[in-house]
């Protein structure tokens, strides 16, 4: 499956929207930095099969959608930007779903990618626990926004690599 160019553009648009969502001066949030333990190895195209990497991307976008769809998230961010962000994520989920099912049979996906999906879920669990611990403070959301931007950037670069391998 060749990830469409539109998916890459969508990813870039999502990153731009994330960048625009900042509401407070992030310089005041330095002490709130946290090690979320991004599961980089899950997205390593050399170690894993293409279908597994795509499946991990899918899970990351799904979890990002879930994270930013909460009541607490809606209170933290600009509604218009958030709606645009949802649309980009939804489009990417559709692209990736088509790609994963094309790579392997649907019934094989769950088993084959269980570990990588679990690693992504645990990563987002750590993010959610951090936000809860910080009582969803503006700085906690800023730190999470920066973290999601970094993980998106990382996966975007890997998607470019996957397209080149084709």
């Amino acid at each position: 499956c060749d990830l469409p160019q539109t998916h890459s553009l969508g990813n870039r648009r999502a990153l731009i929207l994330l960048a625009q969502m900042g509401r407070i001066s992030h310089f005041s949030c330095l002490k709130d930095r946290y090690d979320f333990g991004f599961p980089q190895e899950v997205f390593d195209g050399n170690q894993f099969q293409k279908a597994q990497a795509i499946s991990a991307f899918h899970e990351m976008i799904q979890q990002t959608f879930n994270l930013f769809s909460t009541k607490d998230s809606s209170a933290a961010w600009d509604e218009t930007l958030l709606d645009k962000f949802y649309i980009e994520l939804f489009q990417q989920l559709n692209d990736l779903e088509a790609c994963v099912t094309q790579e392997v049979g649907v019934e094989e996906i769950a088993l084959m990618n269980e570990d990588s999906i679990l690693a992504v879920r645990k990563y987002f669990q750590r993010i959610t626990l951090y936000l809860m611990g910080k009582k969803y403070s503006p700085c906690a959301w800023e730190v999470v926004r920066a973290e999601i931007m970094r993980s998106f950037s990382f996966s975007t670069n890997l998607q470019k690599g996957l397209r080149r391998k084709d």
């Epitope: 960048a19 992030h26 005041s28 979320f36």
Partner: antibody
Amino acid sequence: EVQLVQSGAEVKKPGESLKISCKGSGYSFTSYWIGWVRQMPGKGLEWMGIIDPSDSDTAYSPSFQGQVTISADKSISTAYLQWSSLKASDTAMYYCARHPGLNWAPDFDYWGQGTLVTVSS
Amino acid sequence: DIQMTQSPSSLSASVGDRVTITCRASQSIDEFLNWYQQKPGKAPKLLIYFASSLQSGVPSRFSGSGSGTDFTLTISSLQPEDFATYYCQQAHSFPLTFGQGTKVEIK
């Protein structure tokens, strides 16, 4: 390969203006902040301020607030440090360094080679 | 502002010695502390970040410890290339501040 390349040494007279630069390459320039550090002859390191090139938001040390201006042009991956009126006490080596922002990653992991600014009448 | 105080300001040691430099913050900075090495005419080089994480490419003889207000940089066995000035820097909040430096000289 990540690199921060600073502009060359400058010799200026008191009262003159100056703008020095720091060009980043080998990484996503807008994903990191750029900090500026002063080192006067034979002295220690002093943090001056920082900029987020993605939105040009800045923060300054109170000691340098109003004395210098930090800016960036993300289209050419370059950060700047400028003075509108130099003083003899501005004579120092100035370093730029990249900072991971709010991400959990090493602070100031890459530094420019430094720009020596000499202010003398 | 958070003040950073390093001690000693200078020390003399021999190759193979174990060297310890301490850094104290004027208020708690959790583990937001970095250590840098600077040689004459060169830019500083990051050694340790977040109090105890070894920066990529830095020899394992360098280690950092501490949290809150008291921190330590240890060089387990001093090598000829380690003679330099070392700075601690708090990364907890702006304005970022450095210690005054510790110069490690040859005995």
